[in-house]
C-alpha cells in the first residue's frame, strides 16, 4: 500500500499496517456542490433505453435506501416511440461501498461492503457469440 | 432514525443516539457473487452513447481510484456509425459514499463523504425549454 506520513494529531492506533478497523465520522461531507439534481432526474424517462427505479431498503445497511434501475424494455425506443429489438437496453452497473452493521443491530460497529447496483440503462448493439 | 435493538455483543459506545463516530471493519465483504464483470465491460464501446473512462486517483480517499465516464459525443451513434445530433448523449450520475482521511494522512481515522460520479452514458431525447 501507499506509505502515508503519520500525523502527530491522528487518533491513536495500535496497528502499524493499513488498519483493519478504523474510526469513521458519519457526519457526511457532501462534495456535490456544483450539480443540479434536477438535470438528470428525468433521464430515466427520456432515454432510448428507459428505466424504472426500485427502492431497495435494508435497515442493517448504511445507506439504508438504495435505488435500483430496471430497464423497461428488452430493446431500445425509436424516434417514433416503437421499440427496436435488434438493439438491447442494458443496465449500467457500478460497485459501490456501503456500511453493514456487524454484529447485526449494533449501532456503532460496521463492516465495509461492496455491492453492485444498476444505476440506469443504455442502448447497445448486440454482438454474435462466436463459438470457437 | 430507526430504533435499533441493542445487541449485548456490540462493541461499547458512550453515545446513546445514532453514532457520530463508529468503528468500521475494512475487510470488505463482496456481495457480488452472481455477476460476471465481463458482461458490462464493453458497454462503453457498444452503446449508442459511448463513453471513455477516466481515472480519478486520490490517496486521501478510500477507494483511492474511481473511474469517471465522459460521453464521447454530444449526439448518439446511429446504426450506420454516424452521430445523430437530434439526440443527446448524457452521463448517468450517481452519488456514492467514500471514506476521506481526516485528519489528513491519518491511517485509521476517516470521515464519510458523498461524491457524485458519472457511471456511463445514455441517449436521451432533448426537450424544449419553455420560457414562461
Amino acid at each position: 500500500g501507499i506509505a502515508i506520513p503519520r500525523n502527530s494529531g491522528c487518533p491513536n492506533s495500535e496497528d502499524k499496517n493499513f488498519p483493519r478497523t478504523v474510526m469513521v465520522n458519519l457526519n457526511i461531507h457532501n462534495r456535490n456542490t456544483s450539480t443540479n439534481p434536477k438535470r438528470s432526474s428525468d433521464y430515466y424517462n427520456r432515454s432510448t433505453s428507459p428505466w424504472n427505479l426500485h427502492r431497495n431498503e435494508d435497515p442493517e445497511r448504511y445507506p439504508s435506501v438504495i435505488w435500483e434501475a430496471k430497464c423497461r424494455h428488452l430493446g431500445c425506443v425509436k424516434a417514433d416511440g416503437n421499440v427496436d429489438y435488434h438493439m438491447n437496453s442494458v443496465p449500467i452497473q457500478q460497485e459501490i461501498l456501503v456500511l453493514r452493521r456487524e454484529p447485526r443491530h449494533c449501532p456503532n460497529s460496521f463492516r465495509l461492503e461492496k455491492i453492485l447496483v444498476s444505476v440506469g440503462c443504455t442502448c447497445v448493439t448486440p454482438i454474435v457469440h462466436h463459438v470457437a | 432514525g430507526i430504533a435499533i435493538p441493542r445487541n449485548s455483543g456490540c462493541p461499547n459506545s458512550e453515545d446513546k443516539n445514532f453514532p457520530r463516530t463508529v468503528m468500521v471493519n475494512l475487510n470488505i465483504h463482496n456481495r457480488n457473487t452472481s455477476t460476471n464483470p465481463k458482461r458490462s465491460s464493453d458497454y462503453y464501446n457498444r452503446s449508442t452513447s459511448p463513453w471513455n473512462l477516466h481515472r480519478n486517483e486520490d490517496p486521501e480517499r478510500y477507494p483511492s481510484v474511481i473511474w469517471e465516464a465522459k460521453c464521447r459525443h454530444l449526439g448518439c451513434v446511429k446504426a450506420d456509425g454516424n452521430v445523430d445530433y437530434h439526440m443527446n448523449s448524457v452521463p448517468i450520475q450517481q452519488e456514492i459514499l467514500v471514506l476521506r482521511r481526516e485528519p489528513r494522512h491519518c491511517p485509521n481515522s476517516f470521515r464519510l463523504e458523498k461524491i457524485l460520479v458519472s457511471v456511463g452514458c445514455t441517449c436521451v431525447t432533448p426537450i424544449v425549454h419553455h420560457v414562461a
Epitope: 430493446g75 429489438y85 448486440p126 454482438i127 454474435v128 | -
Partner: antibody, heavy 123, light 108 residues
Framework: EVQLVESGGGLVQPGRSLRLSCAAS????????MHWVRQAPGKGLEWVSG????????GYADSVKGRFTISRDNAKNSLYLQMNSLRAEDTALYYC????????????????WGRGTLVTVSS | EIVLTQSPATLSLSPGERATLSCRAS??????LAWYQQKPGQAPRLLIY???NRATGIPARFSGSGSGTDFTLTISSLEPEDFAVYYC??????????FGGGTKVEIK
C-alpha cells in the same frame, strides 16, 4: 457434446399446468440468452418466451403472457417453462433454443435447438 | 405485428438445380432477417442471419440477400440433403422472433 434436451411434456387437460425443463450441456450456459419456441402439429414455428443470461431481461409472446413463466437456474444449467391455464391451442412440440447473442444478451436468432418435447392439451 | 410471407409454399426441383426462395415482410425489417432449415422429425437449423451472413458450418451453396421488405434465400445447386422446409424470421419488431409460414423444397 453441445446439446439441449427438453423434458416434461405430456398429455394434460385444459386449464391445468405443466412445467417443461431444458438441460444444457457442452457449453457455458450462463454465456447465453435462452428461448422457448413451439411448433403446432403440421404448422410453422412460433416464439414463446426468452430470457437473458441473468434473468434480468424476459419476454413473452402475447399469446402466452400472464399464463407462462420462463426461468433459468445457471447453477444447474437448466431452463424452465411453467405453463399454467393451458388451452387446446397450446398443443405443440416445444423446443428449447439458444440465442446467438454474445455476453448472454439477446440477438433474437437461434443457433442451437433441442429435439423438442410434445405438449398435448386435450380433455 | 410484422407478417412474413414466404413464397412459393412448395418448390419442386431436382438435385443439382438452383432454388430461389422468397420472404416478404409487411413492413421494413432492414437487414434483420434470418433463414432456418427444418427436416422432418428434426429441430430447425440456422442457415443465414442478418440477411446475408452464413451461420457457422453452413455450406457455401446457401446464400441470402435482400433488405427492407424483400429477401431471398438461394441454394445454388441442390444436394439430396437440402430437401426440407425453410423458414424466414425477423428480429426487428415485436414480437422479436416472428417466423414466416415456410417453403417446402421437395424432390421433383
Amino acid at each position: 457434446e453441445v446439446q439441449l434436451v427438453e423434458s416434461g411434456g405430456g398429455l394434460v387437460q385444459p386449464g391445468r399446468s405443466l412445467r417443461l425443463s431444458c438441460a444444457a450441456s457442452g457449453f457455458t450456459f450462463d454465456d447465453y440468452a435462452m428461448h422457448w419456441v413451439r411448433q403446432a402439429p403440421g404448422k410453422g414455428l412460433e416464439w414463446v418466451s426468452g430470457i437473458n443470461w441473468n434473468s434480468g431481461g424476459i419476454g413473452y409472446a402475447d399469446s402466452v403472457k400472464g399464463r407462462f413463466t420462463i426461468s433459468r437456474d445457471n447453477a444447474k444449467n437448466s431452463l424452465y417453462l411453467q405453463m399454467n391455464s393451458l388451452r387446446a391451442e397450446d398443443t405443440a412440440l416445444y423446443y428449447c433454443a439458444r440465442d446467438m447473442g454474445g455476453f448472454g444478451e439477446f440477438y433474437w436468432n437461434f443457433g442451437l435447438w433441442g429435439r423438442g418435447t410434445l405438449v398435448t392439451v386435450s380433455s | 405485428e410484422i407478417v412474413l410471407t414466404q413464397s412459393p409454399a412448395t418448390l419442386s426441383l431436382s438435385p443439382g438445380e438452383r432454388a430461389t426462395l422468397s420472404c416478404r415482410a409487411s413492413q421494413s425489417v432492414r437487414s434483420y432477417l434470418a433463414w432456418y432449415q427444418q427436416k422432418p422429425g428434426q429441430a430447425p437449423r440456422l442457415l443465414i442471419y442478418d440477411a446475408s451472413n452464413r451461420a457457422t458450418g453452413i455450406p457455401a451453396r446457401f446464400s441470402g440477400s435482400g433488405s427492407g421488405t424483400d429477401f431471398t434465400l438461394t441454394i445454388s445447386s441442390l444436394e439430396p440433403e437440402d430437401f426440407a422446409v425453410y423458414y424466414c424470421q425477423q428480429r426487428s419488431n415485436w414480437p422479436p422472433a416472428t417466423f414466416g409460414g415456410g417453403t417446402k423444397v421437395e424432390i421433383k
